[in-house]
């Protein structure tokens, strides 16, 4: 019982985790104008890992695609690098944790290949979690880094009198999503790990003893005992389960240039 | 089309207030801004400040915040500029304008000539 | 607060000449996010409300005659008018969309010689 909650757990709980990281990663909200100790602009800038977007005070929104990929900062490549390859393991992982799933009964799938499954599935998600919360990460620093040599030179003087205010960026609401979405994703593997251990089956092999007993000839041959996970191997009463969850990130699409400084 | 249009000229006495009325009509009055901006007898324009009817945000320039308030009526389409304690020196025309994209006025009333004189 | 400075005051231009005005920012008003400058150009005739002429300091806006033009970027920008017409006698403001408050130039008249 407690095996088939922890890895129906783990799997519920990777879903919202990967759910997370796909909507993270089409977000534009990675870093948003910095409006603290800034003058106030009637302009809002805020970026993605895609394309840039203006929204001005009249409540019109811009946004721009980077249609250039060489001309892309190479952290910026990083992250969207370690983004996709967090959603593929964590898609994949989905998918084989469906079919390790043990509330789900296909043919006549060995408890061992349902562990395997399991731990393969776990792995995957471990994995694309770490990968979310360094792309994240990674995309952090280099706004933390930027910030502060923006800061630097936050008032350039041009021709004396005239200044030009530096656009800085800070912690948009994306970076808060990955994190906690591959937080999610993490905690998910590491409790379809847990549960692995539990659905593999112990092999504990005992020699044939025979014991001879006055008048009667009875022979005990206790062997290939299983450890019992406190479930039987009836499957007539059980439900299947499918998962399943989408998440659609709506996001208005208008036809600049990225800016990292 | 769009058209914004504005209450009647108004002659008040130091001290009174006043309330201007601008009645949009040819669009979605929440969609867009309503700013205020002030001329005063054979001067510049003044931006005084602007109201979003959708959200309810107001941002008013330095020179015009506690005398001067902003506020609107969705049912009637209409947004307000109200003037307490007037002086002598907010004898101006002022006029509302619709903010459209690129933070531009595209459409503006016809003004309304306040004059405070005792 | 952003000063946006215009120059001349007045200008005397004649019939079918060019007239040029000047407007200087305090700030750039130049968005990086879009690579656009966020200054306006207002018409305003005797007795009438402004009339928007140009918009992101050089796109024109509709019904507006393409004797008008705006240029410049940054801080210093200009408002073209290439041949005078009669009825273009008006006073002419900059205003910055960029920054609050939204500051308008001092304005510029422009007469015919």
């Known amino acids: 019982m407690a095996v088939t909650a922890c890895q129906g757990l783990g799997f519920v709980v990777s879903l919202i985790g990967i759910a997370g990281i796909i909507a993270a990663t089409c977000m534009d909200q990675w870093s948003t104008q910095d409006l603290y100790n800034n003058p106030v602009t009637a302009v809002f800038n805020y970026q993605g890992l895609w394309r840039s977007c203006v929204r001005e005070s009249s409540g019109f929104t811009e946004c721009r695609g980077y249609f250039t990929l060489l001309g892309l900062p190479a952290m910026l490549q990083a992250v969207r690098a370690l983004m996709i390859v967090g959603i593929v393991l964590g898609a994949i992982g989905l998918l084989v944790s469906i079919f390790a799933l043990k509330c789900i009964r296909i043919g006549s799938m060995e408890d061992s290949a349902k562990a395997n499954m399991t731990l393969t599935s776990g792995i995957m998600f471990i994995v694309s979690g770490l990968c979310a919360i360094a792309g994240v990460s990674v995309f952090a620093n280099m706004l933390v880094t930027n910030f502060w040599m923006s800061t630097a030179n936050m008032y350039t003087g041009m021709g004396g009198m005239v200044q030009t205010v530096q656009t800085r960026y800070t912690f948009g609401a994306a970076l808060f999503v990955g994190w906690v979405a591959g937080g999610l994703t993490l905690i998910g593997g590491v409790m379809m790990c847990i549960a692995c251990r539990g659905l593999a089956p112990e092999e504990t092999n005992y020699k044939a003893v025979s014991y001879h007993a006055s008048g009667h000839s009875v022979a005990y041959k206790p062997g290939g005992f299983k450890a019992s996970t406190g479930f039987g191997s009836n499957t007539k009463n059980k439900k299947i389960y499918d998962g399943g969850a989408r998440t659609e990130d709506e996001v208005q699409s208008y036809p600049s240039k990225h800016d990292y400084v | 089309q769009i058209q914004l249009v504005q209450s009647g000229s108004e002659l008040k006495k130091p001290g009174a207030s006043v309330k201007v009325s601008c009645k949009a009509s040819?669009?979605?009055?929440?969609?867009?801004?309503i700013n205020w901006v002030r001329q005063a007898p054979g001067q510049g324009l003044e931006w005084m400040g602007w109201?979003?009817?959708?959200?309810?945000?107001?941002t008013y320039a330095e020179g015009f915040t506690g005398r001067f308030v902003l506020s609107w009526d969705t049912s009637v389409s209409t947004a307000y500029l109200q003037i307490s304690s007037l002086k002598a020196e907010d004898t101006a025309v002022y006029f509302c304008?619709?903010?459209?994209?690129?933070?531009?006025?595209?459409?503006w009333g016809q003004g309304t000539l306040v004059t405070v004189s005792s | 607060d952003i000063v946006m400075t215009q120059s001349p005051d007045s200008l005397a231009v004649s019939l079918g000449e060019r007239a040029t005005i000047n407007c200087k920012s305090s700030q750039s008003l130049l968005n990086s996010g879009n690579q656009r400058n966020y200054l306006t150009w207002y018409q305003q005739k005797p007795g009438q409300p402004p009339k928007l002429l140009i918009y992101w300091a050089s796109t024109r806006e509709s019904g507006v005659p393409d004797r008008f033009s705006g240029s410049g970027s940054g801080t210093d920008f200009t408002l073209t008018i290439s041949s005078l017409q009669a009825e273009d006698v008006a006073v002419y403001y900059c205003?910055?969309?960029?920054?609050?408050?939204?500051?308008f130039g001092g304005g510029t008249k422009v007469e015919i010689k």
């Open positions: 304008a619709r903010l459209y994209y690129g933070n531009r006025f595209d459409s």
């Open positions: 040819g669009y979605t009055f929440t969609n867009y801004g």
């Open positions: 109201i979003n009817p959708g959200t309810g945000e107001t």
């Open positions: 205003q910055n969309a960029y920054y609050y408050p939204l500051t």
